[in-house]
Amino acid sequence: TQDTFRGSVLEGVLPGTSVMQVTATDEDDAIYTYNGVVAYSIHSQEPKDPHDLMFTIHRSTGTISVISSGLDREKVPEYTLTIQATDMDGDGSTTTAVAVVEILDANDNAPMFDPQKYEAHVPENAVGHEVQRLTVTDLDAPNSPAWRATYLIMGGDDGDHFTITTHPESNQGILTTRKGLDFEAKNQHTLYVEVTNEAPFVLKLPTSTATIVVHVEDVNEAPVF
């Protein structure tokens, strides 16, 4: 016999969405009498957020469905429902089981730069030099495509001097020089970087932008004939 069941549903789904089915067996006759007819009910829900009636169960099939809007993985990633199964169509003996409902992540949170402004200093002519690490926060599930950041230099890099990659563990944006900078030609670059996720947003979300002021430091260069 199974006294714990597990199911899953995407956060933000509409009421009426089916989650899972629980089953209790009763060897008594269910054709000519009600002795073997099982009726299901939800006895309790933990946690009771955003309120205590997030799910309903079909009395005769044991199918659990979402009954209320507001499933939010970032607030409650998992619900525990205590299910009662009662024979004689609800008037007889009762047994209890647990249904664990996983709330699966949707990309409903945008990554946000923190901080949004940076200043960096880079020696001229340095190629592959790490200029700055940009930090973002994202409330979606860590290490998922909805959390992993994708960085894009939106402006300020007219000469294609810079590149930005995502650190696989920290999720930081690592800004480096693609080619050497020339202090004499331009001693300051102001870059605008936008961050999104590997996964598309499931709703319209504002994208976060960071500003990086890069100061080019003069290096004493040998005279050229």
Epitope: T1, Q2, D3, T4, R6, G7, S8, E46, P47, D49, R73, E74, K75, V76, P77, E78, T80, V98, V100, E102, L139, A141, P142
Partner: antibody
Framework: QVQLQESGPGLVKPSETLSLTCTVS????????WSWIRQPAGKGLEWIGR???????IYNPSLKSRVTMSVDTSKNQFSLRLTSVTAADTAVYYC????????????WGQGTLVTVSS | DIEMTQSPDSLAVSLGERATINCKSS????????????LAWYQQKPGQPPKLLIY???TRESGVPDRFSGSGSGTDFTLTISSLQAEDVAVYYC?????????FGQGTKLEIK
């Protein structure tokens, strides 16, 4: 590297309340389940309860009437209160981190011994 | 609650030999939707907290030597140490996280013969 550190009184009188705090360093408290697990001397591990960063909790039914957990995300801390303690509550108390939907415990505190005695 | 039962309670194995610890759950911890077994293994040395070795029944935690392996599905699981080292002397626990009432096995004490 994420580190957890338990703190609180090592001695509690019978019928009083045991209070422990776990401080998380080297990483954010957000986005994880934080559990308390205890181990009486020479015995096995017993899960007490867990709290998520939004504050929702689930407790071991055998302790539910006596347990309260809380979280303070601004301090990167979470806490345990166990009321009406008896000698049977004497144990090493560990705090631990688990992932939502996959609550195995990858990070543990060193543990703190709490003795219930008059 | 899902009960976890380990066998044996204690085990003595010679250095370099294979050690096998079993864990049985009172109901299946396999979730058919993702085909994952919600089971973990821990090692605990005296005076230390437990250390995660294996999760999802067979996935080795980062930094854990490859002599440790986990296998099994449904209700029956095994932790194997392919070649016992002196530092492997410890108590080993299994844990299920299929139910939100997380439960551990009673532990298996591993010693050197």
């Amino acid at each position: 590297q994420v580190q957890l550190q338990e703190s609180g009184p090592g001695l509690v009188k019978p019928s009083e309340t045991l209070s422990l705090t776990c401080t998380v360093s080297g990483g954010s408290i957000s986005g994880y389940y934080w559990s308390w697990i205890r181990q009486p001397a020479g015995k096995g591990l017993e899960w007490i309860g867990r709290i998520y960063t939004s504050g929702n909790t689930i407790y071991n039914p055998s302790l539910k009437s006596r347990v309260t957990m809380s979280v303070d995300t601004s301090k990167n801390q979470f806490s345990l209160r166990l009321t009406s303690v008896t000698a049977a509550d004497t144990a090493v108390y560990y705090c631990a981190r688990g992932n939502p939907l996959a609550t195995y415990f990858g990070y543990w505190g060193q543990g703190t011994l709490v003795t219930v005695s008059s | 609650d899902i009960e976890m039962t380990q066998s044996p309670d204690s085990l003595a194995v010679s250095l370099g030999e294979r050690a096998t610890i079993n864990c049985k759950s009172s109901q299946s911890v396999l979730y058919s939707s993702n085909n994952k077994n919600y089971l973990a293994w821990y090692q605990q040395k005296p005076g230390q907290p437990p250390k995660l070795l294996i999760y999802w029944a067979s996935t080795r935690e980062s930094g854990v030597p490859d002599r440790f392996s986990g296998s099994g599905s449904g209700t029956d699981f095994t932790l194997t140490i392919s070649s016992l080292q002196a530092e492997d002397v410890a108590v080993y626990y299994c844990q299920q996280y299929y139910s939100t009432m997380y439960t551990f096995g009673q532990g298996t004490k591993l010693e050197i013969k």
